[in-house]
């Protein structure tokens, strides 16, 4: 089996990626500058740490979480890094153009980088549904479309519904999940005979996927609190996320054992379910007033995640062609919805408590926001899927799905590395 790209892709990818990079450099040259204000250096370092946490989540956490395929682990990690690097650049520009540009140049601050990393994270969540079935040239398209769609969604929600950065970014879970699933739906599905083994997980890659899950687990509180406005809100968000993910780990491991006839624990269930609590409390992490509530949500999220991992893969594999171990898409779609529903329930409780019809209006607005996020995710995902099906991208043949050797140079050209 040749380890080379097809000739057409060898011409297409470097040209496409480097032209795009040159265009980005020009855009940065003409339209951006750094925030030059004097600032306390200690404060600067503290502020940078949040951005660093997000980068670790994206590069190591999501990079390794998606690396559990027997013969697609290299590509998963490296392609994730490639998409993150590209996505952050485009997200900084896009966010600047959408929010600051009328005033002149786009000012780049640590906050812009934080925001851009979170936008790029959306792509890394979505891509789990299609990794192994697309090449880098296609992934570049996916990054550009998804970051643009998410940026515009956030801008629309901010303008129409007047929500702050935290609230409109927390739609990322639902948006990324539905975007990824709709892209996957458009791609060729059936794995031809003889390639089924490639989408199976292996021990060493599964261990690296667990490492990814651990990094995500450790830094999820930073993700949920990164865009909040005051220290009180951030502190509350960090605590609640921590309690929720702690409980979802216990639930995931015990629930996984419970779901197996012999009481065995499934690696795949655990990889995703440990994060369940963090996703479920995302939208309302700063609003939950006490640990026990966050813990209950973590428990419910863990159970839903394990239940989803047990019953949904069959359906997703059949309908969307998503392999059994790529469960982030449907996991996040369920848990993201749970998170949004929790927030809406809080508003409903307010309505009941206050007897104020106007809070009911707030409930409608929140449902409107969620619906808009799902609709834009599905539409832009379908558009991306259709674009990725174009012949010009020279997509890997179905027989070469989930195969590192299609993309990487291995000196020994071993088949079963």
């Amino acid at each position: 089996m040749s380890s080379k790209y097809p000739r057409s892709v060898r011409r297409c990818l470097p040209l496409w990626a480097l032209t795009l990079e040159a265009a980005l450099i020009l855009l940065f040259y003409f339209f951006t500058h750094y925030d030059a204000s004097l600032e306390d250096q200690k404060g600067l370092v503290a502020s940078y740490q949040v951005g660093q946490d997000l980068t670790v989540m994206a590069a190591i956490g999501l990079g390794f979480l998606t690396s559990s395929f027997r013969r697609h682990s290299w590509s998963s990690v490296a392609f994730n890094l490639f998409m993150l690097a590209l996505g952050v650049q485009w997200a900084i520009l896009l966010d600047g153009f959408l929010s600051q540009f009328p005033s002149g140049k786009v000012v780049i601050t640590l906050f812009s980088i934080r925001l851009a990393t979170m936008s790029a994270l959306s792509v890394l969540i979505s891509v789990d549904a299609v990794l192994g079935k697309v090449n880098l040239a296609q992934l570049v398209v996916m990054v550009l479309v998804e970051v643009t769609a998410l940026g515009n969604l956030r801008m629309v929600i901010s303008n129409i519904f007047n929500t702050d950065y935290h609230m409109n970014m927390m739609h990322i879970y639902v948006f990324a999940a539905y975007f990824g699933l709709s892209v996957a739906w458009c791609l060729p599905k059936p794995l031809p005979e003889g390639t089924e083994d490639k989408d199976q997980t292996a021990t060493i890659p599964s261990l690296s996927a667990m490492l990814g899950a651990l990094f995500l687990w450790m830094f999820w509180p930073s993700f949920n609190s990164a865009l909040l406005r005051s220290p009180i809100e951030r502190k509350n968000a960090v605590f609640n996320t921590y309690y929720a993910v702690a409980v979802s780990v216990v639930t995931a491991i015990s629930g996984s054992s419970l779901a197996h006839p012999q009481g065995k624990i499934s690696k795949t269930y655990v990889h995703s379910a440990v994060l369940a609590g963090g996703v479920a409390v995302g939208t309302s992490c700063h609003l939950i007033p006490s640990p026990w509530l966050a813990m209950v949500l973590g428990l419910v999220a863990g159970l839903i995640s394990v239940g989803g991992a047990k019953y949904l893969p069959g359906c997703c594999n059949r309908v969307l062609g998503i392999p059994h171990s790529s469960i982030m898409g449907y996991n996040f779609s369920l848990l993201g919805l749970l998170g949004e529903i929790i927030y809406i329930v809080l508003l409903v409780l307010d309505t009941v408590g206050a007897g104020n019809g106007m809070i009911g209006f707030q409930v409608l607005l929140s449902i409107g926001e969620l619906s808009l996020a799902i609709v834009i995710a599905l539409m832009s995902g379908l558009l991306t899927g259709l674009l990725l099906n174009l012949k010009i991208w020279k997509a890997p043949h179905e027989a070469k799905y989930f195969d590192d050797q299609v993309f990487w140079k291995f000196p020994h050209l071993a088949v079963g590395f």
Partner: antibody, heavy 129, light 109 residues
């Protein structure tokens, strides 16, 4: 007690620059967002800019975007407003204000409220040729 | 961008009277982020009400605020001589900019 003292105001020609400072004391400066607000002669209050408690995020009114820069030095408990390309309509009394975050809780939810709960006495900026 | 419209522009009343000032946003806003300020000549502004209805520390109970997301009011139940001043509503939620209303002037009759 909480004290905010603005300085740096004065008379300046159009197109020139000025830097306002606001020295804070009596509270943990690094835990609060800070605002600049101005009042032009005979006009109402106009919000100018805000900076988050850690300095990571800044927002500006459309009328000053691209010309004014808000910053803070938490080690010196000081807030700044760098004003470039000043115009006649920037003539005003400039106040710095602390953004208080207050909250209350029910059994199921915490509510956050924001209000500028401490203000300086203001510093006057006159832009005139 | 949200615009806050205050009405009336000016009111002339006597001490002891009750007054209600209105603040209307151009579109829906969350009441958690609406505040009222008092500005007396030559003094710094003072926070009266936050979260549309909660009195700030040290503010007498004759000041009260209520509001739905489309209409907010500040009520002073019995006017005292020191209450004659400018009153501004301000919104600081969602996405900036954070606008002030144009103000209501309360004059002594």
């Amino acid at each position: 007690q909480v004290q905010l003292v603005e300085s740096g105001g004065g008379v300046v020609q159009p197109g020139r620059s000025l830097r306002l400072s606001c020295a804070a004391s009596g509270f943990t400066f690094s835990s609060y967002g800070m605002h600049w607000v101005r009042q032009a002669p005979g006009k109402g209050l106009e919000w100018v800019a805000v900076i988050w408690y850690d300095g990571s995020n800044k927002y500006y009114a459309d009328s000053v975007k691209g010309r004014f820069t808000i910053s803070r030095d938490n080690s010196k408990n000081t807030l700044y407003l760098q004003m470039n390309t000043l115009r006649d309509d920037d003539t005003a009394v400039y106040y710095c204000a602390r953004e208080g975050t207050l909250y209350s809780s029910s059994w199921y939810r915490r509510y956050y409220y924001y209000g500028m709960d401490a203000w300086g006495q203001g510093t006057t900026v006159t832009v005139s040729s | 961008e949200i615009v806050l419209t205050q009405s009336p522009g000016t009111l002339s009343l006597s001490p002891g009277e009750r007054v209600t000032l209105s603040c209307r946003p151009s579109r829906y806003i969350a009441s958690d982020y609406l505040a009222w300020y008092q500005l007396r000549p030559g003094q710094a502004p003072k926070l009266l009400i936050y979260g549309a209805s909660s009195r700030a520390t040290g503010i007498p109970d004759r000041f009260s605020g209520v509001g739905s997301p489309t209409d907010f009011t500040l009520t002073i139940s019995r006017l005292e001589p020191e209450d004659f001043a400018m009153y501004y509503c301000h919104y600081s939620g969602g996405s900036p900019p954070y606008p002030f209303g144009q103000g209501t002037r309360l004059d002594i009759k």
